[in-house]
């Protein structure tokens, strides 16, 4: 396998935690934001088949030496790079060995199965956000706040490949409760579950909860889109969501085909295929210009899945920032 | 282990200050440092910091003005242009507590006495 | 750019009473805070870092919680040596800044 990083720990040498070199040095990665798509290339680079969870490294035994340091604090990864050496990365600023990242792969040399997801977060934007709801036995149960913890959303956001959890114990809104039954309550997860699921809790069904007490929890949405400076929401300069952060997209390479995908992913009909004057008219962005030589083939779903620079690299001004005209 | 600021003046409007944070027991190679001030009788006020890569980041008031460097092991400046009467402080640095047992802690636990910076005709 | 308000700007209180403070973050910072003490003409004093971890040294009256936006200083059993000015810090990102709170006056009666 490659001298610049490892797994460790594991029953086969394609589980375990994170272990990476620098400088001639082995360290850990910490897991703010690491999810399935980190997996799933750590998993390419080590020639280990398919990613299959994000267990947190401190399942894994013997844990980190402690002369050896966090080197990373955050990988973002589309999930398309050959290495996590391509991957967007981020210096270490605060993180313990006790949020280290772990790692598992479909090793090709056994029968290791993912463990199927049965957990999601309802009636909220997007599937990294909303009402936490479990499934059991085919049925989908609301989760009570009672003993909810953040260590308990931690599971959640990662389990779901949502990145960090940003929010917990945040009431329901009204039209949001759950009309599903309560499955339980008294959650107490240590945060370094695989799963929900394994986290220890009340009785199935036992508890005397009502549904205006239905867990909501928020995590880091993975990517996000919008248009803006338009007239409505489906015209204007475009900004993509990455680490919380909206930035702008260099117009480098940029055509019909990508406009085509903006207008699919945001439910704009199809692109009206402004001029170049046109585009102009809603000025630059400010902060970020977050993406550049953007390649799509019309056929994604989401700008996510275009071919691009890793996060932040381009060579652009926010003269050149992107913007889309759909027929709304 | 200790930091200091040294540097402080009373300046005219106008001109330009470098201010000098140097570390006693300990060098920057491992820690984040950051400038932060105090205007009289105000709050505290981050200015900018320079990591243990070297890499910078500024309030996007004192961009431009402001510039943070690493001079020597034990060292870091910050050098001021332009200054103006909005600029009268007390400028503190304060360092991250770094790795402990290789986990990295980003707190500020260290800070300096400051030094006085007076901009007045 | 990340700004931190903080909550209230001054509080009174009796000896043995209670303070909280209170501080947000305009976006998610996880559990990268920390609050510090000042006292005239001197630097701050980091009390507590993680958002609720006590640093050493200093007396477990003083109580740190909360996570990605909301957090709160509790300040039990006051006593006139806490007579000071509270700050919230951020130090969360590369990208973030070190932002502090406004800060907020508390004074011991």
């Known amino acids: 396998s490659p001298s610049g990083v490892r797994l460790v720990g594991g029953l086969h040498r394609c589980e375990g935690r994170v272990e990476v070199e620098q400088k001639g040095q082995w360290g850990t990665v910490c897991d703010d934001g690491w999810d399935i798509k980190d997996v799933a290339v750590l998993c390419r680079e080590l020639g280990c088949g398919a990613a299959s969870g994000t267990p947190s490294g401190i399942l894994y035994e013997p844990p980190a030496e402690k002369e050896q340091k966090v080197l990373i604090q955050s990988v973002s990864c589309t999930g398309t790079e050959d290495t996590l050496a391509q991957c967007e990365q981020e210096e270490v600023y605060d993180c313990s060995h006790d949020e280290d990242a772990g790692a598992s792969c479909e090793n090709p040399e056994s029968s290791f199965s993912p463990v199927p997801e049965g957990v999601r977060l309802a009636d909220g934007p997007g599937h990294c956000k909303g009402r936490v709801e479990v499934k059991h036995q085919n049925q989908w149960y609301t989760v009570c706040q009672t003993g909810w913890s953040l260590r308990a959303a931690k599971v959640v956001c990662r389990q779901l490949g949502c990145g960090r959890a940003v929010l917990t114990q945040k009431r329901c809104n009204k039209h949001a409760y759950g009309r599903k039954p309560i499955w339980l309550s008294q959650m107490s997860c240590s945060g370094r579950e695989a799963t929900l699921q394994d986290c220890p809790s009340g009785p199935w069904g036992k508890n005397t909860c009502n549904h205006d007490e239905d867990t909501w929890v928020e995590c880091e949405d993975p990517f996000d889109l919008r248009l803006v400076g338009g007239d409505n929401l489906c015209s204007g300069r475009l900004e993509v969501l990455h680490k919380g952060v909206w930035g702008s997209v260099c117009d480098d390479n940029w055509g019909e085909k990508e406009d085509q995908v903006v207008c699919k992913q945001l439910g704009c009909g199809k692109s009206l295929s402004p001029s170049f004057r046109d585009r102009k008219c809603y000025g630059p962005g400010v902060g970020r210009i977050w993406l550049d030589n953007v390649r799509c083939s019309g056929e994604e779903q989401s700008l996510e899945q275009c071919q691009h620079r890793f996060w932040g690299f381009h060579d652009c001004t926010h003269q050149e920032d992107v913007a889309v005209i759909c027929s709304g | 282990q200790s930091v200091k600021e040294s540097g402080g003046d009373l300046v005219k409007p106008g001109a330009s200050l470098t201010l000098t944070c140097t570390a006693s027991?300990?060098?920057?190679?491992?820690?984040?440092m950051c400038w932060v001030r105090q205007a009289p009788g105000k709050g505290l006020e981050y200015i900018g910091y320079?990591?243990?890569?070297?890499?910078t980041h500024y309030a996007s008031w004192a961009k431009g003005r402001f510039t943070i460097s690493k001079t020597l092991s034990t060292t870091v400046t910050l050098q001021m242009t332009s200054l103006t009467d909005a600029d009268t402080a007390t400028y503190f640095c304060?360092?991250?507590?770094?790795?402990?047992?290789?986990?990295?802690?980003?707190?500020?636990?260290?800070w300096g006495p400051g030094t006085l910076v007076t901009v007045s005709s | 750019e990340l700004v931190m308000t903080q909550t209230p700007s001054s509080a009174s209180e009796p000896v043995g009473g209670t303070v909280t403070i209170k501080c947000q973050a305009s976006?998610?910072?996880?559990?990268?805070l920390a609050w510090f003490q000042q006292k005239p003409g001197q630097p701050p004093k980091l009390l507590i870092y993680?958002?609720?971890t006590l640093e050493s040294g200093v007396s477990s009256r003083f109580k740190g919680s909360g996570f990605g936006t909301e957090f709160t200083l509790t300040i039990s059993d006051l006593e006139c040596a806490d007579a000071a000015t509270y700050y919230c810090?951020?130090?969360?990102?590369?990208?973030?800044?070190?932002?502090f709170g406004g800060g907020t006056d508390v004074v011991v009666k």
């Open positions: 320079i990591s243990y890569s070297g890499a």
């Open positions: 304060a360092r991250d507590r770094g790795y402990v047992d290789g986990s990295y802690y980003g707190d500020f636990n260290l």
């Open positions: 993680r958002a609720s």
């Open positions: 810090q951020s130090y969360y990102g590369s990208g973030y800044g070190k932002t």
């Open positions: 027991g300990f060098d920057f190679s491992s820690n984040t």
């Open positions: 976006q998610s910072i996880a559990s990268r």
